[in-house]
C-alpha cells in the first residue's frame, strides 16, 4: 500500500495529477461506514469543503483526495476530518516551466561517486495502473531505453553521466492525457572513500615566544568529513584562563576531502606556559595522528638548532 502523506508542507507543479493520503487509513475494510470530509482554506476563504460538486477536478477515495490535475489556485491549507481525527497539510502549487521538460524547483539532487554504482529507475507506485508509458530524458533529450513501462539506468558512474534526468509518466484518466515528471540532478564526484587523516607540518615544533606576549598555534590537517581535530594541554584542559581554542575552520578540497585548521591562542604568556607540550590530535575511525608544540623563551633559542622552529 502507498504510504500516507506525512510531510506537512508540500510543493507540486501545476497541471500534474496529485494526491493527498491521510495517515489514519485503516487497511482492513471498516465494518461501518464513516462520514469523512476534506476541507481547504486559503487567504480569501475559510474551510471550504472539497467534493466533486465544489470542483470537477476532485476525486475522493477511502483515504485519498485526488486532483485531476492540480492547478495554481489549489494552493492553500488542506484538512482531512473523520470523527475526532484531523490532519493538516500546506500545499504550494508552483508554475510549470514551459520552456523545459522539468521545473527547477522540483528537482531532487543526488551525488554519485565516479566508478560507483549509479541507478535511476522510473517508478510511480500510486498511479502505476493508469500509466500508459514512461520516458526517461537526460537534459531534456529522450533516452532510447528498452523498457517503456519502467525505464531504468544501471551502470558504474562516469563523469559524462552528470546531468538532469527526468522520468515522465504518461497516463490517461477520464479520456484525458496527463503526465507526471520526477527529475534528478545527478552530480558525479571523485572517489570519496576515506583517507587516513594527516596533520600538516613537523611532528614537534618549538615556538620562540616572549613573556607577556600572545601566540597563536595553528594546527592544520587533511581529513574526512566525520573526523575530529582537537587540542590537549596541561593536566586538565580549560584550567588556564589565558588559553583559548578558536573555532575550527574547514574548507572542502576538490577531491571531496576537508582541510581543517584549529588555532590555540595563548595570551599573556607566563613561565608556566614554557617547556610544556601542547598537543594537537586528529582522530578518525582509522586511528589518530598527533603533533606537539613547545613554547621556548626567545633568549633560550640559541641552544636549539634553527630548523626546528615554527615562526
Amino acid at each position: 500500500a502507498e504510504s500516507c502523506t506525512s510531510r506537512p508542507h508540500i510543493t507540486v507543479v501545476e497541471g500534474e495529477p496529485f494526491y493527498l493520503k491521510h495517515c489514519s487509513c485503516s487497511l482492513a475494510h471498516e465494518i461501518e461506514t464513516t462520514t469523512k470530509s476534506w476541507y481547504k482554506s486559503s487567504g480569501s476563504q475559510e474551510h471550504v469543503e472539497l467534493n466533486p460538486r465544489s470542483s470537477s477536478r476532485i476525486a475522493l477515495h477511502d483515504c485519498v483526495l485526488e486532483f485531476w490535475p492540480v492547478e495554481l489556485n489549489d494552493t492553500g491549507s488542506y484538512f482531512f476530518q473523520m470523527k475526532n481525527y484531523t490532519q493538516k497539510w500546506k500545499l504550494n502549487v508552483i508554475r510549470r516551466n514551459k520552456h523545459s521538460c522539468f521545473t527547477e524547483r522540483q528537482v531532487t539532487s543526488k551525488i554519485v561517486e565516479v566508478k560507483k554504482f549509479f541507478q535511476i529507475t522510473c517508478e510511480n507506485s500510486y498511479y502505476q495502473t493508469l500509466v500508459n508509458s514512461t520516458s526517461l530524458y537526460k537534459n531534456c533529450k529522450k533516452l532510447l531505453l528498452e523498457n517503456n513501462k519502467n525505464p531504468t539506468i544501471k551502470k558504474n558512474a562516469e563523469f559524462e553521466d552528470q546531468g538532469y534526468y527526468s522520468c515522465v509518466h504518461f497516463l490517461h484518466h477520464n479520456g484525458k492525457l496527463f503526465n507526471i515528471t520526477k527529475t534528478f540532478n545527478i552530480t558525479i564526484v571523485e572517489d570519496r572513500s576515506n583517507i587516513v587523516p594527516v596533520l600538516l607540518g613537523p611532528k614537534l615544533n618549538h615556538v620562540a615566544v616572549e613573556l607577556g606576549k600572545n601566540v597563536r598555534l595553528n594546527c592544520s590537517a587533511l581529513l574526512n568529513e566525520e573526523d575530529v581535530i582537537y587540542w590537549m594541554f596541561g593536566e586538565e584542559n580549560g584550567s588556564d584562563p589565558n588559553i583559548h581554542e578558536e573555532k575550527e575552520m574547514r574548507i572542502m578540497t576538490p577531491e571531496g576531502k576537508w582541510h581543517a585548521s584549529k588555532v590555540l591562542r595563548i595570551e599573556n604568556i607566563g613561565e608556566s606556559n614554557l617547556n610544556v607540550l601542547y598537543n594537537c590530535t586528529v582522530a578518525s575511525t582509522g586511528g589518530t595522528d598527533t603533533k606537539s608544540f613547545i613554547l621556548v623563551r626567545k633568549a633560550d633559542m640559541a641552544d636549539i638548532p634553527g630548523h626546528v622552529f615554527t615562526r
Partner: nanobody, 123 residues
Framework: DVQLQESGGGLVQAGGSLRLSCAAS????????INWFQQAPGKERARAWV??????????YYVDSVKGRFTVSRDNAKNTVYLQMNSLKPEDTAFYYC??????????????WGKGTLVTVSS
C-alpha cells in the same frame, strides 16, 4: 445486460423520510464507488453531486446541504446501495440518479448510470 435501477422515489411532506435504492444487474456493484446526483425537474443543468459511498463501504462523503439528514449504505451481497433521506425539505425536490465509478467524483467520470427516480417534497 448491464444496468443500474433506482427506486423508492415519490411524494413526501416536508420533514418526512424516503429510502431510495440503487440496484445493479450485469456487473458487481461492490467494485465501484456509488455516487448520487440530483437534477431539479425542468432544469437541464448538469447533474449535481450529492453524496457517495466508496467501494469498500468504509467511507461516505456528503455535500454540506444534506449532511446529518441523508445516510448512504450498501449491501454488496444484494448488489444494492441505499440512500436514507430524513428531514426532507422542499429544496430536496429533484430527480435522483445513482452512478457507479472508480471514485467519488464528477459526473463525467462515471462508468454506469441509472435512469433516475423523482423525489418531490411538498411544503
Amino acid at each position: 445486460d448491464v444496468q443500474l435501477q433506482e427506486s423508492g422515489g415519490g411524494l413526501v411532506q416536508a420533514g418526512g423520510s424516503l429510502r431510495l435504492s440503487c440496484a445493479a444487474s450485469g456487473f458487481t456493484l461492490g467494485a465501484y464507488a456509488i455516487n448520487w446526483f440530483q437534477q431539479a425537474p425542468g432544469k437541464e443543468r448538469a447533474r449535481a453531486w450529492v453524496l457517495c459511498i466508496t467501494s469498500s463501504g468504509g467511507s461516505a462523503y456528503y455535500v454540506d446541504s444534506v449532511k446529518g439528514r441523508f445516510t448512504v449504505s450498501r449491501d454488496n451481497a444484494k448488489n444494492t446501495v441505499y440512500l436514507q433521506m430524513n428531514s426532507l425539505k422542499p429544496e430536496d425536490t429533484a430527480f435522483y440518479y445513482c452512478a457507479a465509478g472508480g471514485a467519488c467524483a464528477a459526473a463525467e467520470t462515471m462508468n454506469y448510470w441509472g435512469k433516475g427516480t423523482l423525489v418531490t417534497v411538498s411544503s
